[in-house]
């Protein structure tokens, strides 16, 4: 039986060029944490297995870093990078888990305020 | 219904070898990564080896580095573990399990015992 719960870092915005921290947590379990797979869509960006380490994708090795923890860091953040991002917690003996996050990324700042400024 | 099926385990005296063999049937979703796991009696389930699909990237726990070897068939839906100088510390149940972007499936295990 699945007890589990996910709790992640929800909807979130940042700057293009900046960067950001995916965060998922997987409570109420005594379950064993085998993998965690992050996905964007249906891209594969990396692997933690909790034995074996990080696996990064290669198409993401130059913009996506691991951590903190179990967490995932993408980094030089495009507009290309708004939607949906899955934490796929991989447990024995319970099952898989998902959480999901969506994350836009927004125009800088100096643009955003440009963009208001009114001529009188 | 998934369905992955090991075999190749068996009694073996320290020193030899053994190929473990892991098929696979009825994957629904897109193939992450293959891997094998062994359980020693009292012991947790632990990660020796991985392959992941996208680049074909291997992965070894400390405990089997340069004595173990992780491949994979994609045609034949095949991961295999080629074990050499086996030592009684590798006693075990072998698992071998993969990741799909949908979960993830195990078989039902191998017994490797090394005897000295």
């Known amino acids: 039986m699945m007890t589990g719960t996910i709790e992640t870092t929800g909807n979130i915005s940042a700057e293009k060029g900046g960067s950001i921290i995916l965060q998922c947590h997987l409570s109420s379990t005594t379950a064993q944490v085998t993998q965690v797979n992050w996905e964007q869509q249906d891209q594969l960006l990396a692997i933690c297995n909790a034995d074996l380490g990080w696996h990064i994708s290669p198409s993401f090795k130059d913009r996506v870093a691991p951590g903190p923890g179990l967490g995932l860091t993408l980094q030089s953040l495009t507009v290309n990078d708004t939607g949906e991002y899955f934490c796929i917690y991989h447990t024995y003996p319970d099952g898989t888990y998902t959480g999901r996050i969506f994350l836009e990324v927004l125009e800088s700042s100096v643009a955003e305020h440009g963009a208001r400024f009114q001529i009188p | 219904e998934v369905q992955l099926v090991e075999s190749g385990g068996g009694l073996v005296q320290a020193g030899g070898s053994l190929r473990l063999s892991c098929a696979a049937s009825?994957?629904?979703?897109?193939?992450?990564?293959m891997g094998w796991f062994r359980q020693a009696p009292g012991k947790e389930r632990e990660g020796i080896s991985l392959?992941?699909?996208?680049?074909?990237?291997?992965y070894y726990a400390d405990s089997v580095k340069g004595r173990f070897t992780i491949s994979a068939d994609n045609a034949k839906n095949t991961v295999y573990l080629q074990m050499n100088s086996l030592k009684p510390e590798d006693t075990a149940v072998y698992y071998c399990?993969?990741?799909?972007?949908?979960?993830?499936?195990w078989g039902q295990g191998t017994q490797v015992t090394v005897s000295s």
């Open positions: 399990a993969w990741t799909t972007n949908r979960g993830m499936d």
């Open positions: 009825g994957i629904i979703g897109t193939i992450r990564t």
């Open positions: 392959i992941t699909s996208d680049d074909g990237s291997t």
